[in-house]
Interface confidence: medium
Amino acid sequence: APDTRPAPGSTAPPAHGVTSAPDTRPAPGSTA
């Protein structure tokens, strides 16, 4: 399944990839 987008404020790798939970994009407010 495609990655999901984490909520603002979470940690996002450069390409919006997987963060702490697989298949989610971080929330707003994250550190890149």
């Epitope: 495609p2 603002p8 404020g9």
Partner: antibody, heavy 120, light 108 residues
């Protein structure tokens, strides 16, 4: 009720800048990325970029890097999009759109749009 | 960068089924969303993640996505369905891309 209300129509001369606003209400502003999408007359939708309302971090589409700036003021729940060095082909309807949080990038709420006309 | 190809127009008689396609390389592995836009109005989310209906959207609207084609299907088409329809893809490598849009015309 949840809504995004955008600023009024603008008429600008080539080379000028324009700053549009998008005021959010009815939901937690900090909980959703805000995107900007434009649509030239009779044309399709073009994604411009997003802003993280918490950090102010941005990601711009390649076509807009260097002449678009997205900012926000969390105290008044408002996102802004500024375009510089306007050209006639920047004449378009500009929409802000809220991204669903923690999902797959869909936009579940759109502003009504702001028409920007660039003419000498 | 993804490129999404939609037919410019689709015509259908009332009560029949309309199918609007969105072609893209390996699109079946990506998140596809569909928007409806009526003249003079902002777009409205119709289908997200390929097949999930947005709130308030009739069951007549459905979506599928596999291989190199995503499809928006509108069954028992009504005059009020006449609009432009856009597919949109997000994946972790290509950001957000819209298809060129398809104008749905309801005949008669």
């Amino acid at each position: 009720r949840m809504q995004l209300v955008q600023s009024g129509a603008e008429v600008k001369k080539p080379g000028a800048s324009v700053k549009l606003s998008c005021k959010a209400s009815g939901y937690t502003f900090a909980g959703h990325y805000m995107h900007w999408v434009r649509q030239a007359p009779g044309r399709g939708l073009e994604w411009m970029g997003w802003i993280d309302p918490v950090t102010g971090g941005t990601k711009y589409a390649q076509n807009f890097q260097g002449w678009v700036t997205m900012t926000r003021d969390t105290s008044i729940r408002t996102a802004y999009m500024e375009l510089s060095r306007l050209r006639s082909d920047d004449t378009a309807m500009y929409y802000c759109a809220r991204e669903v949080t923690g999902d797959r990038g869909q936009f579940d709420k759109w502003g009504q749009g702001t028409l920007v006309t660039v003419a000498s | 960068q993804s490129v999404l190809t939609q037919p410019p127009s689709v015509s259908v008689a009332p009560g029949k089924t309309a199918r609007i396609t969105c072609g893209g390389n390996n699109i079946g592995s990506k998140s596809v969303h569909w928007y409806q836009q009526k003249p003079g109005q902002a777009p409205v989310l119709v289908i997200y993640y390929g097949s999930d209906r947005s709130s308030g959207i009739p069951e007549r609207f459905s979506g599928s996505n596999s291989g190199n084609t995503a499809t928006l299907t509108i069954s028992r088409v009504e005059a009020g369905d006449e609009a432009d329809y856009y597919c949109q893809v997000w994946d972790s490598s290509s950001d957000w891309v819209f298809g060129g849009g398809t104008k749905l015309t309801v005949l008669g």
